[in-house]
Interface confidence: low
């Protein structure tokens, strides 16, 4: 999906209002210095591409982020403010669709969410610059 035509201001507002709080809640009990940020992004569409990938694509050691509250909010926000984004989600797997209780948070998932926080901060910062 090409995030170029998203309403970035609206996405920023939703992030600051709600998504950020859920990310921080997920990370509660860990220090920001516990993980090194290895994922970055260069502009707003690129940041959203990386955010979507880290949030919704399962990895071998962290398969369940898509069911978290911050992920559901991210999906709703992208679907609202990125034209046509909803259509790209129609073939999402059953596992992505279902809501299940979170199992024990693995260190790898905490690391991935730490990367997400970094990407979102980068996204906010790029809003201050001319694209």
């Amino acid at each position: 999906y090409d995030f170029t035509n998203c309403d970035f201001q609206k996405i920023e507002a939703d992030y600051l209002r709600t998504i950020s709080k859920d990310l921080i809640t997920y990370m509660s009990g860990t220090k920001s210095t516990d993980f090194n940020n290895t994922v970055s992004c260069s502009n707003r569409p690129h940041c959203l591409t990386e955010i979507q990938s880290l949030t919704f694509n399962p990895t071998p050691r962290c398969a369940s982020l898509a069911k978290e509250m911050f992920a559901r909010k991210t999906k709703a926000t992208l679907a609202l403010w990125c034209p046509g984004y909803s259509e790209t989600q129609i073939n999402a797997t059953q596992a992505m669709k279902k809501r299940r209780k979170r199992k024990v948070t693995t260190n790898k998932c905490l690391e991935q969410v730490s990367q997400l926080l970094g990407l979102w901060r980068r996204f906010i910062r790029t809003l201050l610059k001319k694209q």
């Epitope: 609206k10 509250m69 909803s86 259509e87 669709k97 809501r99």
Partner: antibody, heavy 122, light 108 residues
């Protein structure tokens, strides 16, 4: 307890306007998406419109698009539906319903009002 | 636009199991919600997200969803279960909420 109460229904002539209201109580109104759903006499449920929790997004069924406007006042815990250019086929019981904002874009409707009857007839 | 198809009526003997179906193209990829509506009353949510149940709904009500059919199952049917039942999804391609036509459940 959590409650939604609709008002404003009545009999109106075709082409005229009517404004429905829905008063919410017992829950934090400003954090929920809100919908209008209608049911013509003896017929099934038909979704009408949605408004995002903070009013920044609205969407309408094709059958009412351009004629109906959904609004909300979070300071007063009220939802409104302004219905213009009414037609006979708009005759129905109108329900307001809430949906958890973030579960998906349009989640299940977990609380409904009792409905208000709108009759469009000359 | 997306269409949900329900049988107009289903009958069940007291104590037996009733199954109400909701058909739609690849409905298994969507979250399906079910409502019960008794005459003169507002609808009540009985199953959401295919198979989850609100706290106020008895365990006799359950749901499933795969392929092109979602099913609401009511076990040990009672006279009080007589009502119209509606399935509902969100059609993401049109951003519209869609209801099935409704099924009248009769407990014989």
């Amino acid at each position: 307890q959590m409650q939604l109460v609709e008002s404003g229904g009545g009999v109106v002539q075709p082409g005229r306007s009517l404004r429905l209201s829905c008063a919410a109580s017992g829950f934090t109104f400003r954090t929920y998406g809100m919908h209008w759903v209608r049911q013509a006499p003896g017929k099934g449920l038909e979704w009408v419109a949605v408004i995002w929790y903070d009013g920044t997004y609205t969407h309408y069924a094709d059958s009412v698009k351009g004629r109906f406007t959904i609004t909300r006042d979070n300071s007063k815990n009220t939802l409104n539906l302004q219905m213009n250019s009414l037609r006979a086929e708009d005759t129905a019981v109108y329900y307001c319903a809430r949906s958890p904002q973030w579960e998906s874009i349009f989640e299940a409707f977990d609380i409904w009002g009792q409905g208000t009857m709108v009759t469009v007839s000359s | 636009s997306y269409v949900l198809t329900q049988p107009p009526s289903v009958s069940v003997a007291p104590g037996q199991t009733a199954r109400i179906t909701c058909g739609g193209n690849n409905i298994g990829s969507k979250s399906v919600h079910w409502y019960q509506q008794k005459p003169g009353q507002a609808p009540v949510l009985v199953v959401y997200d295919d198979s989850d149940r609100p706290s106020w709904i008895p365990e006799r009500f359950s749901g499933s969803n795969s392929g092109n059919t979602a099913t609401l199952t009511i076990s040990r049917g009672e006279a009080g279960d007589e009502a119209d039942y509606y399935c509902q999804v969100w059609d993401s391609s049109s951003s519209l909420v869609v209801f099935g036509g409704g099924t009248k459940l009769t407990v014989l």
